[in-house]
């Protein structure tokens, strides 16, 4: 989604004194070099003992508007035989990121910085066994 929208509810954009565009450079620069992204493994989500799927989270009023989020496939972990191990739990690893959210009904549009928790993958942990008293 675009970051600087115009709205029919906003002042006349034809007016010479109206600030039509606030240009913000939102390009993401890769300081580690161009080759780093090609090394990102995309098959861990299937090979992991706590496999996950990725979902395309869309929000037109957010920048970035598209964020890929992980969701654990199972509550339990997968053992070497490919069966679910009921002594081990699959848990989501979450990362806090900063996003820009469009303020509703503001003219010109303004954005606020918000924190967002995003699932980035899943890991396997031992189940908590509660002893009977």
């Amino acid at each position: 989604a675009a970051i600087i929208p115009q709205s029919s509810a906003c002042p006349n954009t034809e007016a010479k004194d109206f600030l039509q565009n606030v240009k913000v450079n939102l390009k993401v620069f890769n300081s580690l070099g161009a080759k780093v992204s090609s090394r990102r493994p995309s098959d861990y989500l299937n090979r992991s003992t706590s496999p996950w799927t990725l979902h395309r989270n869309e929000d037109p009023d957010r920048y970035p508007s598209v964020i890929w989020e992980a969701q654990c496939r199972h509550q339990r972990c997968v053992n070497a035989e490919g069966k679910l191990d009921h002594h081990m739990n699959s848990v989501l690893i979450q990362q806090e990121i900063l996003v820009l959210k469009r303020e509703p009904e503001s003219c010109p549009f303004t954005f606020r910085v918000e924190k967002m928790l995003v699932g980035v993958g899943c890991t396997c942990v031992a189940s908590i066994v509660r002893q009977a008293a």
Partner: antibody, heavy 119, light 107 residues
Framework: EVQLVQSGAEVKKPGASVKVSCKAS????????FHWVRQAPGQGLEWIGV????????AYNQNFRDRATLTADKSTSTAYMELSSLRSEDTAVYYC????????????WGQGTLVTVSS | NIVMTQSPATLSVSPGERATLSCKAS??????VGWFQQKPGQSPRLLIY???NRYTGVPARFSGSGSGTDFTLTISSLQPEDFAVYFC?????????FGQGTKLEIK
């Protein structure tokens, strides 16, 4: 120079499957989403789905969820779209297109692959 | 799903004249609209993104406007190579949808 080169035309029988490829060059393959769009003869464009080669994530148009499978091979910078249980209505030109996820638009398109479904 | 409706289906204009193509969304799509040109046997070519931004290398005679539900593509002075089919498309929310196209023909 960014290029998306698709595989050649296919003729299939109803009920069969087809797998169309789209080879990317001129940029880092894993940085952008690949979307697949089809165009039936003389018709408009219909969005099939998306794959992100960087993380393997996929999303589909509900109309294709049960029959379309999108995959990507990072070693060859190639995206694939497989459509199963073909019927005559699937006769169309299938396009791959690169989507700039942050900027939010389709910029480069493949040349298209004509898939004809006929008994 | 968001429906994109283009009008007219066919537009006959003489070279050198101005052409105005319309696209209406079934619900607000902010400015998340693109315009594509397609010639017979070719793939779509991006002209305008975010409703009014001209894509790299697109001639200045092409301009886009609108927000919310109503969008317009204007070609100020038609050149012979501009006669083609034009599609609008929304990427506000998936499934991304396209208009049925406007065929721009020589009068």
């Amino acid at each position: 120079e960014v290029q998306l080169v698709q595989s050649g035309a296919e003729v299939k029988k109803p009920g069969a499957s087809v797998k169309v490829s789209c080879k990317a060059s001129g940029y880092t393959f894993t940085d952008y989403e690949f979307h697949w769009v089809r165009q039936a003869p003389g018709q408009g464009l219909e969005w099939i789905g998306v794959i992100h080669p960087g993380n393997g994530g996929t999303a589909y148009n509900q109309n294709f969820r049960d029959r379309a499978t999108l995959t990507a091979d990072k070693s060859t910078s190639t995206a694939y779209m497989e459509l199963s249980s073909l019927r005559s209505e699937d006769t169309a030109v299938y396009y791959c297109t690169r989507f700039l996820t942050y900027e939010g638009y389709f910029d480069y398109w493949g040349q298209g692959t004509l898939v004809t479904v006929s008994s | 799903n968001i429906v994109m409706t283009q009008s007219p289906a066919t537009l006959s204009v003489s070279p050198g004249e101005r052409a105005t193509l319309s696209c209406k969304a079934s619900q607000s799509v902010s400015i998340d609209v693109g315009w594509f040109q397609q010639k017979p046997g070719q793939s779509p070519r991006l002209l305008i993104y975010h409703a009014s931004n001209r894509y790299t290398g697109v001639p200045a005679r092409f301009s886009g406007s609108g927000s919310g539900t109503d969008f317009t593509l204007t070609i100020s002075s038609l050149q012979p190579e501009d006669f083609a089919v034009y599609f609008c498309q929304q990427d506000y929310s998936s499934p991304y949808t396209f208009g049925q196209g406007t065929k721009l023909e020589i009068k």
